[in-house]
């Protein structure tokens, strides 16, 4: 931009430097220039010089009217035409910026990551504004009355060494912007209520050569938390549909998973836990992909008998991506012997 | 209970600079917000300039480029470094606790005079 230009005059705009986004727009430049009694006065928007809208007020200032500006940014700069001059001579020089007021952010959600020594606040900041927007996050303890304040862009990191007085916190958000100022609803927070495990990782798969061949996927995670509930997701490469097993966890071992899957195919398997009762999963695992082995025996694949788990009074559903484009949106399988569980925040679907 | 004292005021040719101080005592000024704010002679409080207990910083558009606000959490202190002064910024400087609003506390101020 045109910040630190020397100006032989001034330039100002009305309403002003940064203004809604359509509003109509006056430019106003004034010469101040030695030894020149300008001919004509012209205005530039980006390097390109401007041709309508433009009224000469008097001899030493001209005006150009822009309706319903609506350019993010836009460098102006003024010239005069000197007598006597070959070139143009510089006026003045302005940035210039358009936007929108923020909206109030919405789905505030924070969430501690086991092991991260952070409380990790995030929200929805609504439409663009087209102009520098800060986030002030308010953090206020419920039980002290003390608030804590932390600048943010997108979304903020606050260390839990400085939530030690308390464990109930009223958290919201604050936008600010040169247009406007809007606070989200305000979220109850018990730290205790928002830890997300340490990640889950499947380790490995194997096949087994039995005469109905079975599956064990083997996965782990470093938590310390005692109660865990999972959800394991899987699915053919090929296929749409995610078949999901729920299950309690407990990691004080390597958990094994064992599955009647269709031979001679390429399935993808995912996992995700949280803690019992509580709100926060932990987004999917990174996909695990496995090759079942061909079948040896002479028994016909009967495709019905899929998914079963070998694990009891646990529940399998499946879940269909309605698009790849559209990796959020799951659309239920109508089959009588599954019950709906949708599979959300589905940051790493595979096709 | 909170107490803020202000410092480093004066009169300043235009284009001059000033250093202001804010000295905070009764919180703790190391988990704290910070802001400054300003009233004109005749005018309303103008919210400046704010900091977060981690140093990150947000400025009114005129003084946006000219102003710098920072902490010392060591000798809990606020700070607003005035450069390229404009007889418009001529008002009575205060410091208040929060990263922003036109509001402060009840402080004394410093008077910052722009003129030539």
């Known amino acids: 931009g045109i910040t630190s230009i020397n100006c032989s005059g001034d330039m100002w705009v009305e309403p002003g430097e940064i203004f809604q986004m359509g509003m109509n727009v006056s430019i106003y430049c004034q010469e101040a220039l030695k030894h020149c009694r300008p001919r004509n006065l012209y205005f530039y928007k980006n390097g390109f010089k401007e041709e309508f809208d433009i009224t000469r007020i008097n001899r030493t200032t001209a005006r150009i009217w822009y309706k319903g500006f609506s350019e993010p940014h836009a460098y102006m700069h003024c010239t005069a035409e000197c007598p006597g001059h070959f070139q143009e001579t510089l006026i003045c020089g302005k940035d210039i910026s358009s936007g929108h007021p923020p909206d109030a952010p919405s789905n505030l959600t924070c969430v501690i990551y086991e092991y991260s020594g952070n409380m990790t606040c995030t929200w929805n900041t609504g439409k663009p504004t087209y102009i520098d927007t800060k986030y002030i996050v308010h953090v206020k303890s419920l039980e002290t009355e003390e608030e804590q304040q932390y600048l943010a862009s997108s979304y903020v990191k606050i260390s839990t060494d400085s939530l030690q007085g308390s464990r109930k916190y009223l958290v919201w958000v604050q936008a600010v912007n040169s247009l406007g100022m809007e606070n989200s609803q305000q979220l109850h927070v018990h730290l205790d209520d928002i830890v997300i495990p340490s990640a889950s990782i499947i380790s490995r798969a194997e096949t087994t050569n039995d005469t109905v061949p079975k599956t064990i996927v083997y996965w782990k995670s470093k938590t310390m938390i005692e109660k865990v509930f999972c959800e394991m997701r899987y699915k053919t490469t090929t296929n749409q549909t995610w078949s999901v097993k729920e299950f309690d966890a407990n990691f004080t071992y390597v958990q094994q998973s064992e599955f009647y899957l269709e031979p001679d195919s390429k399935y993808v398997f995912q996992v995700r836990c949280q803690e019992t009762g509580k709100r926060n999963w932990q987004p999917w695992s990174s996909p695990f992909v496995h090759q079942t082995s061909q079948e040896t025996g002479k028994r016909n694949w009967q495709p019905w008998s899929s998914p079963f788990v070998h694990q009891t009074s646990q529940t399998v559903s499946q879940v269909t991506a309605k698009s790849s484009h559209e990796p959020q949106k799951m659309e239920m399988l109508s089959a009588t012997i599954f019950r709906g569980h949708p599979a959300s925040g589905n940051h790493q679907d595979i096709g | 209970q909170v107490q803020l004292q202000e410092s480093g005021g004066g009169l300043v040719q235009p284009g001059g600079s000033l250093r202001l101080s804010c000295a905070a005592s009764g919180f703790t000024f190391r988990l704290s917000a910070m802001r400054w704010v300003r009233q004109a002679p005749g005018k309303g409080f103008e919210w400046v300039s704010g900091i977060d207990s981690r140093g990150s910083t947000i400025y009114a558009d005129s003084v946006k480029g000219r102003f710098t606000i920072s902490k010392d959490n060591a000798k809990n202190t606020l700070y607003l470094q005035l450069n390229s002064l404009k007889t418009e910024d001529t008002a009575m400087y205060y410091c208040?606790?929060?990263?922003?609003?036109?509001?402060?506390?009840g402080s004394q101020g410093t008077q910052v005079t722009v003129s030539s």
């Open positions: 208040a606790q929060g990263v922003y609003g036109d509001t402060y506390s």
